[in-house]
């Protein structure tokens, strides 16, 4: 004969546990129904009556099957440096993430406490590691034979084009310039971007030629979008 199905509330067999989506109520000493996500326990069960559930009020939620007396409060509205990627509903908390071009510099238990704008790599340097939702951009000097002429949080160093006849040699922040005859092959048809979760846009510049092919920590600054390495006050 099949075992009889017990309806909540019921007293569990000694040594056994309550079934899925049930909990053991210590006061009633019975297995009782949990409330579904989006609800909470309005009235706890007794020996003769099951849990009475009610919907979460506005701006509150429960994400799991539960028997909490009150729903959890949704987090405060997203601050100006963040965007809401998940709305507050009866079944889930609001999730805020840093807006495009920013990353979470200081996190908290759930979400981000403070966002900061991503760093960019200056001409002569390319992105070694792109920014993510929780980490800043890492830059590296462009190796000999490669260049970056942008101030960007996505552009990597790319190879100089190879010329039949070189008019101006390339350096770390400028592509080689070929004579009017076309190059044997162009190794750098366009800026190369690293994929990354934060949407970014690079700015291209026309820097003046530099004397060296690889940057040092004191390389000449191109005109265009690169402020000086010094803390200039423009006096």
């Amino acid at each position: 004969l099949p075992a009889q199905v017990a309806f909540t509330p019921y007293a569990p067999e000694p040594g056994s546990t309550c079934r899925l989506r049930e909990y053991y109520d210590q006061t009633a000493q019975m297995c009782c129904s949990k409330c579904s996500p989006g609800q909470h326990a309005k009235v706890f069960c007794t020996k003769t009556s099951d849990t009475v559930c009610d919907s979460c009020e506005d701006s509150t939620y429960t994400q799991l099957w539960n028997w909490v007396p009150e729903c959890l409060s949704c987090g405060s509205r997203c601050s100006s440096d963040q965007v809401e990627t998940q709305a507050c509903t009866r079944e889930q908390n609001r999730i805020c993430t840093c807006r495009p071009g920013w990353y979470c510099a200081l996190s908290k238990q759930e979400g981000c406490r403070l966002c900061a704008p991503l760093r960019k790599c200056r001409p002569g340097f390319g992105v070694a590691r792109p920014g993510t939702e929780t980490s800043d951009v890492v830059c590296k000097p462009c190796a000999p034979g490669t260049f970056s002429n942008t101030t960007s949080s996505t552009d990597i160093c790319r190879p100089h084009q190879i010329c039949n006849v070189v008019a101006i040699p390339g350096n770390a922040s400028m592509d080689a310039v070929c004579t009017s005859t076309s190059p044997t092959r162009s190794m750098a048809p366009g800026a190369v971007h690293l994929p990354q979760p934060v949407s970014t846009r690079s700015q291209h510049t026309q820097p003046t030629p530099e004397p060296s092919t690889a940057p040092s920590t004191s390389f000449l600054l191109p005109m265009g979008p690169s402020p000086p390495a010094e803390g200039s006050t423009g006096d």
């Epitope: 200081l106 704008p117 000097p141 101030t151 803390g231």
Partner: antibody, heavy 125, light 110 residues
Amino acid sequence: EVQLVESGGGLVQPGGSLRLSCAASGIDFSSYGISWVRQAPGKGLEWVAYIYPDYGSTDYATWVNGRFTISLDNSKNTLYLQMNSLRAEDTAVYYCASGYASSSGYYDPKYFGLWGQGTLVTVSS
Amino acid sequence: DIQMTQSPSSLSASVGDRVTITCRASEDIESYLAWYQQKPGKAPKLLIYDASDLASGVPSRFSGSGSGTDFTLTISSLQPEDFATYYCQHGFYTSRSDSVFGGGTKVEIK
């Protein structure tokens, strides 16, 4: 030479308006986040507003309360601060300031490595 | 809103002295802190960023330390050109921010 030059300051009556300009040479504002920072006479530095042109985002100190607007004219490579409903307590030297370009190849918008010379705004009747 | 509190507000020192200025953040800001020097009638100048990194062209007698909420700017041997006002700044200027800068510390000649 890389520099920022502010202009547009002067004497204005309470409740009046003023538009400050910050012209850049040697850098392209469209690539950089840039702020306005002010300093009342004999007082400390106070951040006012920030614009990050790449992403079209602007931020203001909470006390601004919608009275000021930061904007950028890319064609002129000039930053503006439109100030309305001015009060006596807005009297200050206003600086534009851009991020820090380190010798290790970073441009970091979090810190102010490049400053203009400042322009004085006096709000008085 | 993160509050930045500097101390002392002013100090007197002599050339050659070791000078220490402190800055306290109202909440943990890890190492996102900068120090500036400002002389009368001039714009501020960045000295230290990321709490301890020396900005380009800044003399090595300036150093920064600390993380979390407590930070220090040290001038190992004060020079005549170092008499100025010094400010700390946290790196999070957004619409939640007011006191991005500390109140300043004026270093005067004793």
